[in-house]
Structure formats: C-alpha cells, structure tokens
Interface confidence: medium
C-alpha cells in the first residue's frame, strides 16, 4: 500500500548474487557498511502496477462500504445498550472503531492505486498512520479479548469486572497508545513523493533500508505473530478447560470467539507470509529477481486485500454466528423504524442477562 524509499543504496539491475559479487569489488563503503546492504533490483513494475490499478480501487471501494455499514451496525448495537458494557463488549466496540477507521482510509488508497496521491503530504502521514494504528489495534484487541476470556474461564478471574470499568478502559488506552507508538514512523517518514518515471505522486516512505526491514518485522511480530500466539494459547487452554468440564453451553458460547480468531488467522496469514518473503529478500536470505519481485508485489496486493476484508468480516460473523447480536440488531432496527412501539418489542429469550451479547460472566457471547 505504501511505497518505500531507502537511503541504503543506488540499486543495481542484477540479482543479489551478482550484486554481492560486483559491489564488494567496485563500491566504496563506510567503516560500518557492508555489501549486504544492496539487495533489491530495480525491476520494472508495470505488471504489478497495472494489476493494482485494476484490482485495488474496486476492492477498496467494496470493503469501504461493507466495513462502514457492518462496523457501524456493531457500534450502534453496542452503544444502544442502556446498561454498562461487559469487558468483551468494550473490546469489541474498540475493535469496531479500529476497523471503521481503517476502512475510512481505503478510498484514499484506492485513488492512490488508480491514479496517484492527490491529497498532499499531511494527509499521506495521517492516512498511513491511521491505517497502521488500526491494523495493529485490530490484532491487539482480539488478543485482549482472548486474554480476558482466558482469565475468566481458565483462572475463573474477572480481571475486568463490570463494576469499575477502569481496567478495561486502561487496557484499551494502552492498546491505542502502543498503536500510536507503532505508527510514529508513519508520521515521521511518510510523505507525498513525486515519481518521475511514472509522472505521478505517491504516498511513500523515505527512510533507511534497515528501518524498512525493522518496520516490516515489527508489523509481522506485533501485528500478527504475537496476537495470534496469545489467541492460540488462550483459546487452547479455554477449550481444554471447557472440554474437561463438559460445559456444552459454554462450548457453544465459545463458537463466535473461535470463529473470529480463525477468521483473523485465515485473513492475515497469507499477507504476512508474503511480507516474510519480502523480509527474507531484503535481508538477502532469498535471492531477489524481477520475476519474484513482481509476483511478491501482486501477492502483496491480493493478500493485503484479503487482510482488509477482515475489517468487514467481524460484523458478518456476529450476524451469522452470534444469535444475540441478531436479536439486538433487530431490536435496534425496530426501535429506529417504529419509535412508538417500544412496548411491543419481543424481548430476547435470555433477558435475564440483557446487558450484554458477549457476556463476560459466561464463556462468551452467551446467547449463542
């Protein structure tokens, strides 16, 4: 999505092997510089750019609409509750906000892919940062939900008790703060950069190669591997406890969170595998050639599209897997459509726990 400019080299046309052979004999490096710096060939990217031009604007436009509607619905349902939100609901509300903010940047990237970046350096920084903040926030909030469930079920501890909501609020604030920290490079290094060859302006990074690789590793670890490990660990233990206790109702209630985590893994794993290949090419562990570079660029576009689909997927999962969400949504629509018929609304069967559709005191999502 965001292009990168690095101060580590003037790139060579050859692949890594040739680069390392030739650079060591012909290039003059400073004391701490080695010829491992030079690993990227300047491949013509006509195919990947044409692919992006055709594929991304349509995809981003669709995801923008679906994401806005879906996450808007989730937020509306959660905020329409008269009682305090459970910890999981609070995390889900923040998740919906994160996903909404992420999809809000998609029209800008659609224009960038279709034509060029016409919004200036300021918005380039903001959109890039917003995009990454919410990418990280989505993953970390899902990890928080799983940790909350883990404490609640495995250790029978309600860390985020409904009484004082300070802990859950502090956790969410910590997540957003951490995401802001992760997005600092975007604020500093992103800018609208005119590309002479394309005769177009694009929102690009402008920082050293080591920074580019470090940022990719951070994205891979903090935005994917760590949250996924936390989720896997927590839900493995939760399922083990529930199976031992033969809590069928609880197991049914776990359905949605498991589906949400599986969706996260399925949506983001392909992209991060491609990023891993890119990192390995940056580090010289994989030879970089024009064919591979072009394939990686196209793969990155396709798999990132799949990843952004995750923003629209959660609301759909709640709608199709979460019975309680459907009930809340139906009630909200009734209330919006028929303001004078509130007394006629059908109360959900689990009205004794009417305050939440992802009950903290239960395994999770109690109405399933």
């Amino acid at each position: 999505m965001v292009l990168e400019v690095s101060d580590h080299q003037v790139l060579n046309d050859a692949e890594v092997a040739a680069l390392l052979e030739n650079f060591s004999s012909s290039y003059d490096y400073g004391e701490n510089e080695s010829d491992s710096c030079c690993t990227s060939p300047p491949c013509p990217q006509d195919f990947s750019l044409n692919f992006d031009r055709a594929f991304l604007p349509a995809l981003y436009s669709l995801l923008f609409l679906l994401g806005l509607l879906g996450n808007g619905a989730v937020a509306a349902v959660l905020l329409s509750r008269r009682t305090a939100l459970s910890s999981t609901d609070t995390f889900l509300l923040h998740l919906a906000v994160a996903d909404t903010l992420l999809v809000l940047t998609l029209p800008l990237w659609a224009v960038d892919a279709a034509v060029q970046w016409v919004f200036g350096s300021g918005l380039c920084k903001v959109a890039g940062a917003l995009f990454n903040i919410n990418f990280y926030a989505g993953a970390l909030l899902l990890a928080c939900i799983s940790f909350d469930r883990y404490l609640n079920i495995v250790h029978a501890t309600q860390l985020y008790r409904r009484g004082p909501p300070a802990r859950v609020t502090l956790t969410c604030l910590a997540v957003w703060g951490l995401c802001l920290l992760f997005a600092l490079p975007d604020f500093i290094f992103l800018s609208a950069h005119h590309d002479e060859r394309l005769n177009a302006t694009h929102c690009q990074y402008n920082f050293p190669q080591v920074g580019r690789t470090a940022l990719r590793v951070l994205q891979l670890v903090a935005g994917f591997l760590l949250p996924l490990l936390v989720m896997a660990y927590c839900y493995a233990h939760i399922l083990a406890v529930l199976l031992v206790s033969r809590g069928q109702r609880r197991l049914r209630a776990m359905r949605l969170v498991v589906v949400v985590v599986v969706a996260f893994a399925l949506c983001w794993t392909p992209y991060h595998l491609v990023v891993l290949v890119d990192i390995l090419m940056d580090l010289g562990a994989l030879a970089r050639n024009c064919g591979r570079e072009s394939r990686v660029d196209v793969a990155k576009s396709v798999t990132s599209g799949l990843g952004y689909m995750h923003c629209c997927l959660n609301p759909l999962l709640y709608a199709f897997v979460g019975v309680k969400f459907r009930e809340r949504m139906w009630m909200l629509l009734l209330r919006l459509g028929c303001p004078n018929q509130r007394g006629l609304q059908r109360q959900p069967s689990s009205s004794r726990r009417d305050s939440s559709w992802s009950e903290t005191s239960e395994a999770s999502y109690s109405g399933l």
Epitope: V5, Q9, L11, A18, E33, Q45, D195
Partner: antibody, heavy 123, light 106 residues
Framework: EVQLLESGGGLVQPGGSLRLSCAAS????????MSWVRQAPGKGLEWVAT????????YYPDSVKGRFTISRDNAKNTLYLQMNSLRAEDTAMYYC????????????????WGQGTLVTVSS | DIQLTQSPSFLSASVGDRVTITCRAS?????IYWYQQKPGKAPKLWIY???NLAPGVPSRFSGSGSGNEYTLTISSLQPEDFATYYC?????????FGQGTKLEIK
C-alpha cells in the same frame, strides 16, 4: 522544472585539485541519489561517482577511487565532486545527473542532466 | 567490467528511413538504457528498462533485446532525430556506456 547547474570547472595542472558543484532546483533534492558523469572531448560518456539521497553511501569506479570524493549538502541542495591528484585523462566535461526513483527504489540510469562544466588538466 | 559495443559507430541515413542501432554487451545484462545527445548539449534519457520510452520521446522510437544484444529502432527518421545515441548498463559496476552511435543526415 528540474534544473541542475554545474560550476567549478577550469584549467588545472596535473596533480592539482578542483572542486565541482552542482546546484539543484525544481525537485526535492533530499529524496534523490545523484551522480557525476564525464565526457572527454569527442569521446563517450563515463560514470564517475554516485551518492545516495542521504549521503550515507558513495560509489566510484576503480578509475577514480581514492582520488575523487562525491558529497552533498542537502540543506543547500548542492552536490559536490572533490577531485584530487588530477591527471591529463581526467580532462572532460563533467555532468551532474539525477537518478530517478521508481516504486521506492533508486534506478541506475539518469533522468535529468545538467549542462556540464569543463575541466581541463594540462601543464 | 562489462563492455558495451555499439554498431555502427556512424550511420548516415535519410529522413523517413528505418534505422536500427545495436548495443552488444560483453556479458549478459538485465536492461539497457539509451540516451540521446546533440552537439554541445547534455545527454537526455531516451529509453529506460530496455523498451520504455522516456516522457516526450516520440513513438517512432522503440527498444528491444535481452541478454547480450539490445537494439534501438527508429521506424521513420525525422530531422530532429539526428544526434548521437549512447547505451548504458547498470547490471554490474562500473556502470558503463557504449562508445556512441552518431546518426548523420545522408
């Protein structure tokens, strides 16, 4: 409009030194790698030196390595070529040239050239 | 070092002619770049990545080739095309140019 204006050329004796300058305008100088390319009278083009956009990395062919030093002052939008131990074969028109950036990568070719400054090494 | 040899070194042709300039590399290169230079002027980027025309270059110019042999072709020579053309490689340092092909009016 991209403009590169070389200066500092002139007549110098063998073994002498000279410092060429190239004033850049019309583009974000700090974002581009820059090079010097020379052309001996009536002869072809020869790459002399390259510097990365931040000035961290410098590149030279063996023919000038150790004698020529490329540098840049990004605050002044200026590229320099310090030439020491000059020889008769260094007599040439010296052009300052810009490397394009495409999808975040420097390219090896040159998309803009200055008009050049003539360096004559003769006793 | 990779040597680039252009042929012919001199070429006399008439307006409307189809002209081909060849650039041979002593060992395989990934891409070739072509520059046009007129007397007393700085070179101008003409073709990049073997076959892409630089902005403002007329469509009568084309580039092709791979490995060791690359060509620049002018389908119908125009008066403003008479100049010297140089090929360049950036596959292996030092980054060399061909000796040039001077295109003259017959």
């Amino acid at each position: 409009e991209v403009q590169l204006l070389e200066s500092g050329g002139g007549l110098v004796q063998p073994g002498g030194s000279l410092r060429l300058s190239c004033a850049a305008s019309g583009f974000t100088f700090t974002s581009y790698a820059m090079s010097w390319v020379r052309q001996a009278p009536g002869k072809g083009l020869e790459w002399v030196a390259t510097i990365s956009h931040g000035g961290t990395y410098t590149y030279y062919p063996d023919s000038v390595k150790g004698r020529f030093t490329i540098s840049r002052d990004n605050a002044k939008n200026t590229l320099y070529l310090q030439m020491n131990s000059l020889r008769a074969e260094d007599t040439a028109m010296y052009y300052c040239a810009r490397h394009p950036i495409y999808s975040g990568n420097y390219q090896g070719y040159f998309d803009y050239w200055g008009q050049g400054t003539l360096v004559t090494v003769s006793s | 070092d990779i040597q680039l040899t252009q042929s012919p070194s001199f070429l006399s042709a008439s307006v409307g002619d189809r002209v081909t300039i060849t650039c041979r590399a002593s060992s395989g290169v990934n891409y070739i770049y072509w520059y046009q230079q007129k007397p007393g002027k700085a070179p101008k980027l003409w073709i990049y990545f073997t076959s892409n025309l630089a902005p403002g270059v007329p469509s009568r110019f084309s580039g092709s080739g791979s490995g060791n042999e690359y060509t620049l072709t002018i389908s119908s020579l125009q008066p403003e095309d008479f100049a010297t053309y140089y090929c360049q490689q950036f596959t292996s340092s030092p980054y060399t140019f061909g000796q040039g092909t001077k295109l003259e009016i017959k």
